[in-house]
């Protein structure tokens, strides 16, 4: 189903963006890239 495919793709993209910021902060000590509280 196309909606499901879109949702899965977006979920993967969102995770990758979050993980990139996480890795930059914890393994790269790039604190300016931290995710701020909502």
């Amino acid at each position: 189903h196309s909606d499901g495919i879109f949702t899965d793709s977006y979920s993967r993209y969102r995770k990758q963006m979050a993980v990139k910021k996480y890795l930059a902060a914890v393994l790269g000590k790039r604190y300016k890239q931290r995710v701020k509280n909502k």
Epitope: V19, L23, V35
Partner: antibody, heavy 108, light 109 residues
Framework: SVEESGGRLVTPGTPLTLTCTVS????????MTWVRQAPGKGLEWIGF?????DAYYASWAKGRFTISKTSTTVDLKITSPTTEDTATYFC??????WGQGTLVTVSS | AAVLTQTPSPVSAAVGGTVTINCQSS???????LAWFQQKPGQPPKLLIY???KLESGVPSRFSGSGSGTQFTLTISDLQCDDAATYYC??????????FGGGTEVVVK
């Protein structure tokens, strides 16, 4: 500081929640990570929770664990433990300040 | 998912000597976000090196890291008895998060 608690002997399938209590750490400014280590084995990354409260997991851990937090604690729920989940569970601020770990033993 | 392979294990050297530990990734480590940890029995891991070559605050300069892409190295020079431990590499993987190597035991003779 970071301190884990809640580890104990449980039977397979019995949900268990581990708690990571922090002091002197603003959880709105740091990532908190859970890592485990089976007896005599290496380190295994489970996942993390960000400042906004969103949690992300290794693919093998998704559905098996749930990470959540309050203002001073970070919880790791093992939803349906199996014997393969027997390990010491570590909580870390980023990956540079770690607790001593808490031992979970899953056995019938 | 990236698989990190550490060699050799175990590795031994005399006090004052040098040991080199290799960490090879099955795919390129994202951003060269590769860290090295030291772990002693009954203790949590301790961060030594981050971003492949940057020394964590308070860690002796006898520890150094190098490498990029898929091949990384930890070097311990002027080996001390206190350096006896297991060392782990950990690399960034945007699909999985963090992948740990299997660990390398360092024995000081």
């Amino acid at each position: 500081s970071v301190e884990e608690s809640g580890g104990r002997l449980v039977t397979p399938g019995t949900p268990l929640t581990l708690t990571c209590t922090v002091s002197g750490i603003d959880l709105n400014s740091y990532y908190m990570t859970w890592v485990r280590q089976a007896p005599g084995k290496g380190l295994e990354w489970i996942g993390f929770i960000d400042a906004g409260g969103d949690a992300y997991y290794a693919s093998w851990a998704k559905g098996r664990f749930t990470i959540s937090k309050t203002s001073t604690t970070v919880d790791l729920k093992i939803t349906s433990p199996t014997t393969e989940d027997t390990a010491t569970y570590f909580c870390a601020r980023d990956l540079d300040l770690w607790g001593q770990g808490t031992l979970v033993t899953v056995s019938s | 998912a990236a698989v990190l392979t550490q060699t050799p294990s175990p590795v031994s050297a005399a006090v004052g000597g040098t040991v080199t530990i290799n960490c090879q990734s099955s795919e390129s480590v994202y951003g060269n976000y590769l860290a090295w940890f030291q772990q002693k029995p009954g203790q949590p891991p301790k961060l030594l090196i981050y971003e492949a070559s940057k020394l964590e605050s308070g860690v002796p300069s006898r520890f150094s890291g190098s490498g990029s892409g898929t091949q990384f190295t930890l070097t311990i020079s002027d080996l001390q008895c206190d350096d006896a431990a297991t060392y782990y590499c950990a690399g960034g993987d945007i699909s999985e998060g963090v992948a740990f190597g299997g660990g390398t035991e360092v024995v000081v003779k």
